[in-house]
Every structure is written in structure tokens, then in C-alpha cells.
């Protein structure tokens, strides 16, 4: 499910890192939880992932 991982450690925002999969994108917050957004449809899905799906 993990396609790309972006390191955000030096970012002042509290996200540790985020990742995108075929069906959802998630942010791992340094407060200690994941916050995920699922894709019901192809709308709003990044072009590369639309193609893969």
C-alpha cells in the first residue's frame, strides 16, 4: 500500500511523514496517530496513482 514516502522531519508542521497508496493517503502525526483519507473514486487521486489503479 505504500507507494511514496516523504520525509517531513524538518517541517515545522507536526507530521512525521506521509504516504500514498492506491486507495488512500495517510499522514503519520508526531502526536502519535495516523490520519488517512480514502478514495471512493478516481476524482482527486494523483495522476500516477490513477494510472496504476
Amino acid at each position: 500500500d505504500q507507494w511514496s514516502t516523504q520525509d517531513l522531519y524538518n517541517n515545522p508542521v507536526t507530521a512525521v511523514f506521509n504516504y500514498q497508496g492506491l486507495w488512500r493517503s495517510c499522514v503519520r502525526e508526531s502526536s502519535g496517530f495516523t490520519e488517512c483519507r480514502g478514495y471512493f473514486t478516481l476524482l482527486g487521486l494523483p495522476a500516477m496513482l490513477q494510472a496504476v489503479r
Epitope: T14, E29, S31, G32, T34, E35, C36, R37
Partner: antibody, heavy 124, light 112 residues
Framework: EVQLQQSGTELVRSGASVKLSCTTS????????LHWVKQRPEQGLEWIGW????????KYAPKFQDKVTMTVDTSSNTACLHLSSLTSDDTAVYYC?????????????????WGQGTSVTVSS | DVVMTQTPLSLPVSLGDQASISCRSS???????????LHWYLQKPGQSPKLLIY???NRFSGVPDRFSGSESGTDFTLKISRVEAEDLGIYFC?????????FGGGTKLEIR
């Protein structure tokens, strides 16, 4: 079905160490953070810290920094809490707790489940 | 640390009554992502805490609709519209917007 199964009751001597375990099932342990929470007899809940099973990163509450070590073995879906230099203040029930949130459109969900707790009694 | 002040400490009710529990945070719980990570748990004797309401007002799966959550700034409220025997126990509010995660001191809901 999401389950967090914790190890059994511990009776330990003052000054000793103890290792508690939390075995998860029903979800991918790498997808969520795993927290440990302490509850002393007849008292409230105290956050100890979290471990991210994806990479082993940990964050501890300052007061537990020198008391605990958290580890995870993703191959066995098991997280552990190691408590050292035990004193009577460490007598408590220790809970593991998995945490995450999300949504699919307007459908919101939470992943927030707790183990049954492990009772630790420190005797002098 | 964010201090979560819960009132009352004890709440005697009759079955069928409405019950209201308050929780005040010492600072804003709005996360940089726009969500407010304020949650309510119920702990019954000899059991682990169970999630009732997450992110202020969302009922967890399987939680009856007599439970509802609301907010006004840094004041948060859990309401039980008609108390049933299975609702008795200790209610905790909790925030995990900020590190460290903190909990309210608990409110014991008991039969009057």
C-alpha cells in the same frame, strides 16, 4: 475483529525490571501507532508514550523517559513495554492502545482499541 | 502540557435521566490539519477504557445515539440523553492534538 492481547499479571520485586507484551490481530500493526497508558489503583489515566511500528520510532512522556523502553516486532505483531528500576510508584495497570483516524468521503472512522491491561504489583 | 479539567467528579443520576459531563482544555485543541482531537471514553469496573466519541462529536462504531459530543471553544461536553444501567462507570475526556497526550481526571456516573 481488532484485538490487543496483553500478557498476564506481574508480581515483581522493588528494583527489578519487567517486560510487558501486547499482541495485536485483526489489522496491520504497521498502519497505526501503538500507545502505552498507565493507570494506578483508583486513579486516572497517564500517557507513557508511543511507538511507530512502521519504523520503530518512539516518543516518551518526559516523566517516563528513564523508566521505560518500547519495542515492536512486526513479524509477530507484538509490542513490548520494558519497565526498569521498579518502585511502588510503578504499581499499576498498563494498557496498550492502537490509534488512528480517517475518512472515506463523508464516512469517518476511528481506530482506537485497548488491550485488557496488565497489572503490575511491585513488592518490597 | 495541556490540562484537561473534567467536571463534575461524580454524577448521581436516575435511570432515564439526561446526563452532561464537561471537559475544559487549557489551550486550543485544533490541530494544524484542522481537526480537533478531543475524545470521550467510558471505563467500566475491571475493564479497559472504551472509545465512545472521537474528534469532539463522532460516535464510535456500535455506540448508541443517546451519546453525543459538542464543543464551544475550549469547552467540551458529553451528553447522554437517557441514562441506562449499562452506561454507569467512569468517563474520561482525552486530547491527542498535542504531545503529551493528556486525560481528564474522570467523572463517575452512578445511580442516585
Amino acid at each position: 475483529e481488532v484485538q490487543l492481547q496483553q500478557s498476564g499479571t506481574e508480581l515483581v520485586r522493588s528494583g527489578a525490571s519487567v517486560k510487558l507484551s501486547c499482541t495485536t490481530s485483526g489489522f496491520n500493526i504497521k498502519d497505526y501507532f501503538l500507545h502505552w497508558v498507565k493507570q494506578r489503583p483508583e486513579q486516572g489515566l497517564e500517557w507513557i508514550g508511543w511507538i511507530d511500528p512502521e519504523n520503530g520510532d518512539t516518543k516518551y512522556a518526559p516523566k517516563f523517559q528513564d523508566k521505560v523502553t518500547m519495542t515492536v516486532d512486526t513479524s509477530s505483531n507484538t509490542a513490548c513495554l520494558h519497565l526498569s528500576s521498579l518502585t511502588s510508584d510503578d504499581t499499576a495497570v498498563y494498557y496498550c492502545n492502537v490509534l488512528g483516524y480517517g475518512n472515506y468521503g463523508h464516512f469517518y472512522y476511528a481506530m482506537d482499541y485497548w488491550g485488557q491491561g496488565t497489572s503490575v504489583t511491585v513488592s518490597s | 502540557d495541556v490540562v484537561m479539567t473534567q467536571t463534575p467528579l461524580s454524577l448521581p443520576v436516575s435511570l432515564g435521566d439526561q446526563a452532561s459531563i464537561s471537559c475544559r482544555s487549557s489551550q486550543s485543541l485544533v490541530h494544524s490539519n484542522g481537526n480537533t482531537y478531543l475524545h470521550w471514553y467510558l471505563q467500566k469496573p475491571g475493564q479497559s477504557p472504551k472509545l465512545l466519541i472521537y474528534k469532539v462529536s463522532n460516535r464510535f462504531s456500535g455506540v448508541p445515539d443517546r451519546f453525543s459530543g459538542s464543543e464551544s471553544g475550549t469547552d467540551f461536553t458529553l451528553k447522554i440523553s437517557r441514562v441506562e444501567a449499562e452506561d454507569l462507570g467512569i468517563y474520561f475526556c482525552s486530547q491527542n492534538t498535542h504531545v503529551p497526550r493528556t486525560f481528564g481526571g474522570g467523572t463517575k456516573l452512578e445511580i442516585r
